[in-house]
Interface confidence: medium
Amino acid sequence: MQKGDQNPQIAAHVISEASSKTTSVLQWAEKGYYTMSNNLVTLENGKQLTVKRQGLYYIYAQVTFCSNREASSQAPFIASLCLKSPGRFERILLRAANTHSSAKPCGQQSIHLGGVFELQPGASVFVNVTDPSQVSHGTGFTSFGLLKL
Amino acid sequence: MQKGDQNPQIAAHVISEASSKTTSVLQWAEKGYYTMSNNLVTLENGKQLTVKRQGLYYIYAQVTFCSNREASSQAPFIASLCLKSPGRFERILLRAANTHSSAKPCGQQSIHLGGVFELQPGASVFVNVTDPSQVSHGTGFTSFGLLKL
Amino acid sequence: MQKGDQNPQIAAHVISEASSKTTSVLQWAEKGYYTMSNNLVTLENGKQLTVKRQGLYYIYAQVTFCSNREASSQAPFIASLCLKSPGRFERILLRAANTHSSAKPCGQQSIHLGGVFELQPGASVFVNVTDPSQVSHGTGFTSFGLLKL
């Protein structure tokens, strides 16, 4: 998209990783058919994509989860794409919500988030979910990425 | 996105086509408000988008389907975005799953898949679903495309 | 994506706005973490994104809604991405459908639409839904945007 040394392509696509951590922030890995164009975008601590260059980015995430209405809280399953910029609080960029299924033992559903946002140098984006234990980590089900316009 | 003769824009958006074939691979057509930027991306056999140039591509698919829990298998409806590169096995890039609805005669649901992937010259991408007979082919409901970064 | 004066970046991301209007066309605002790259794309009347330059655009929308099967019509909730080009009728580019939830008082669900389309100078895109009163306007839930390739 950006050609030559001045404008190298900047893009990433990382794959979900099951985690024993109790945090609501999803974990990712450079595994399988992942993309990491160069060091102008990096996966930090397995949880956030951090960019070195300011600019407009299309950022996306897909989360597949399996839940059951009776076994879950009344609140829906929510996936949030969040931004942490240097010198600023975290903020929500995008959210999607799906009510839990009545299927047993659980019903699978997929959420897709995506949008164009201005990122500052050093900005990080990450994905939060209401219940990480419900996330599906089978091949291709849950992923996260970005591309610089 | 890529300007000049060296870097022509490469993009495609194709429209779902009902098929009598029993294959799980969805069929597509250059009809309606479709996009086919040039011959650097082609729709082959109505089933796969094939690219001539190596590079990073944002690939996406949207599938709307109508299913009923009682009339369907217990397994969810799954849509898969798959890659076939020359000299390599097929592989799954992305998947999404939705449990069948209890609505009668069937309940409509939509799935969206999208991600950034490196494609080799001659690579093809296609979309698989668990039950093609459940796919909705009304205007705009089911489509497939890509753009080269 | 497009560098230099000849090819400025063109991108927009706007945020849903609750409206007292009875129209099925969703309302948007330049608020929160919105994007409006320059005057080559504008938000008109709070309802449509209008572009000044011809070209290929990736256009997307995300709609989160809360509905209940008993309280809603039998027809599913449908979100449509529509195009109005100068001198042409409106046309549907993309649609997604989700059957209403049985959750009470209502069950949240999210829809994502996205695709690559050729737009003419002065073309406008907008989002229609079957029942705007069911749309969720909390931070990040419902948004609309585009980027020029």
């Epitope: 922030v25 942490k84 600023r88 609080f89 903020r91 | - | 973490y33």
Partner: antibody, heavy 120, light 107 residues
């Protein structure tokens, strides 16, 4: 209706500690970042600290860094401010404030405040 | 830290007057400027955010403008309930900082 109710203020000696609480109701507490802002008698507003909705990220003004700790218990819909090594200049009315939906760095609802007096 | 400077520090006005308060940031803060109203013994109340967006429930006689470093709060026709202290706040970067306040008194 959004309500924020601070408690825990009082008179404390320099070097002492105090724990402020803010009970929240009328909104989904865990979805919002929360702030503490203070106002010395007859003076203006000073931001003290903030915490993300999940509680995983915290932020402090330089004047309180290392002495104050912000935390939250989302199961109890309660925000806390643990204040240690208190100084005379910490004397103020302490407000808890909810972060705005569209920009977490501004505040749309405030409690009525609790007075902290640091004096010997 | 970004310093926020309000002027005037206080002003006297009558009901029906048009009142303007200015706020200057020590560096550009884009449109990340917010205004609060505080009455004696009460908590602050958000009036305007993102430079010009009226908070829900705030009367339309309040308006905000500006960008970069210079911002203005205008009350088009002062009402009795508007006599209060007004604070600007930048939400551009941590630490969040407020102006010193402008007290609007009855003439």
């Amino acid at each position: 209706e959004v309500q924020l109710l601070e408690s825990g203020g009082g008179l404390v000696q320099p070097g002492g500690s105090l724990r402020l609480s803010c009970a929240a109701s009328g909104f989904t507490f865990s979805k919002y970042a929360m702030n503490w802002v203070r106002q010395a008698p007859g003076k203006g507003l000073e931001w003290v600290s903030a915490i993300s909705g999940s509680g995983e990220s915290t932020y402090y003004a330089d004047s309180v860094k290392g002495r104050f700790t912000i935390s939250r218990d989302n199961s109890k819909n309660t925000l806390y401010l643990q204040m240690n090594s208190l100084r005379a200049e910490d004397t103020a009315v302490y407000y808890c404030a909810r972060a705005h939906d569209y920009d977490s760095m501004l505040m749309d609802y405030w409690g009525q405040g609790t007075l902290v007096t640091v004096s010997s | 830290d970004i310093q926020m400077t309000q002027s005037p520090s206080s002003l006297s006005a009558s009901v029906g007057d048009r009142v303007t308060i200015t706020c200057r940031a020590s560096q550009s803060i884009s449109r990340y400027l917010n205004w609060y109203q505080q009455k004696p013994g009460k908590a602050p109340k958000l009036l305007i955010y993102a430079e010009s967006t009226l908070q829900s429930g705030v009367p339309s006689r309040f308006s905000g403008s500006g960008s970069g470093t210079d911002f203005t709060l205008t009350i088009s026709s002062l009402q009795p309930e508007d006599f209060a202290t007004y604070y600007c706040q930048q939400s551009y970067t941590i630490p969040l900082t407020f102006g010193q306040g402008t007290k609007v008194e009855i003439k």
